[in-house]
């Protein structure tokens, strides 16, 4: 039984491969799914010698490993691509790597938008 899940309607969107895939590079994504399916947000990125390279962000459809997560946290040690998911609108705006081996917690915040 699922209880009290945060409803996800919109996520931060980003696609590093936007030109090749002919999509927008960044913005907001409105999540659409089937009835009785939960919706989540996700972020994926690479870490090359401490430099964070964002791969994709957006909506992620019904994945039990994402249930009941308020924050986007990855804990895998050294994957080729880091992945995290969460529930709640725009919960993928910031994302965290919290390594199992007791290394430093690293949270990635979006840069502040420049005033117009």
């Amino acid at each position: 039984s699922g209880r009290g899940e945060a409803e996800t309607r919109e996520c931060i969107y980003y696609n590093a491969n936007w030109e090749l895939e002919r999509t927008n590079q960044s913005g907001l994504e409105r999540c659409e799914g089937e009835q009785d399916k939960r919706l989540h947000c996700y972020a994926s990125w690479r870490n090359s010698s401490g430099t964070i390279e964002l791969v994709k962000k957006g909506c992620w459809l019904d994945d039990f490993n994402c249930y009941d997560r308020q924050e986007c946290v990855a804990t895998e040690e050294n994957p080729q691509v880091y992945f995290c998911c969460c529930e709640g609108n725009f919960c993928n705006e910031r994302f965290t790597h919290l390594p199992e081996a007791g290394g430093p917690e690293v949270t990635y915040e979006p840069p502040p938008t420049a005033p117009t």
Epitope: N65, R69, A74, C85
Partner: antibody
């Protein structure tokens, strides 16, 4: 290295109870949903139950609903399966399995513990 | 519940053979289909997830394809360590269900 170690299996009479445990190590247990999958002797795999990262969402196969309860203690890195009103058809090897990150699959499994229900 | 039907239930093959196992879902499951390998007395091991993505560390001779209701696991050149039972599993909706298994035996 990811390790899942089940314990608590054994011989029990029909109508009896058992509690299985799965001790997890080598990964951040609290960041992964977990499941129990069973395999009757000489048969295929059957998903039994699953629990979300916080324990806030739990799901059961119809065959065990109302008799089995899944739970987790993230402070002890341990997954549990409380099995009540056991029947002969519950006889199986019970595996603890981890839900992979971004895979929608069981990416790590324990070696299993045998539960035998017989009089 | 979604029923998963695997075929064949068993097959005999030789080292170096190309082996194909099929899995059919009773309704569309998009690409939410996983493949596992199990050897006698051992726990299952994830080979392929989301129909075609190879799990880290799995040899490239294993491949998966399909979407909707029909899926295929292919072993391009069977090796001695590949003799085992293979299961498909849908992760589209609970209850998550497995196919009946395909036992790959030595000819």
């Amino acid at each position: 290295e990811v390790q899942l170690l089940e314990s608590g299996g054994g011989l029990v009479q029909p109508g009896g109870s058992l509690r299985l445990s799965c001790a997890a190590s080598g990964f951040t247990f609290s960041n992964y949903a977990m499941a129990w999958v069973r395999q009757a002797p000489g048969k295929g795999l059957e998903w039994v139950s699953a629990i979300s990262v916080t324990g806030g969402s739990t799901y059961y196969a119809d065959s065990v609903k109302g008799r089995f309860t899944i739970s987790r203690d993230n402070s002890k890195n341990t997954l549990y399966l409380q099995m009540n009103s056991l029947r002969a058809e519950d006889t199986a090897v019970y595996y603890c399995a981890r839900h992979g990150s971004g895979t929608r699959a069981f990416d790590s499994w324990g070696q299993g513990t045998l539960v035998t229900v017989s009089s | 519940d979604i029923q998963m039907t695997q075929s064949p239930s068993s097959l005999s093959a030789s080292v170096g053979d190309r082996v194909t196992i099929t899995c059919r879902a009773s309704q569309s499951i998009s690409r939410h289909l996983n493949w596992y390998q199990q050897k006698p007395g051992k726990a299952p091991k994830l080979l392929i997830y989301e129909a075609s993505t190879l799990q880290t560390g799995v040899p490239s001779r294993f491949s998966g394809s399909g979407s909707g209701t029909d899926f295929t696991l292919t072993i391009s050149s069977l090796q001695p360590e590949d003799f085992a039972t293979y299961y498909c599993q849908q992760s589209y909706s609970t209850p998550w269900t497995f196919g009946g298994g395909t036992k790959v035996e030595i000819k």
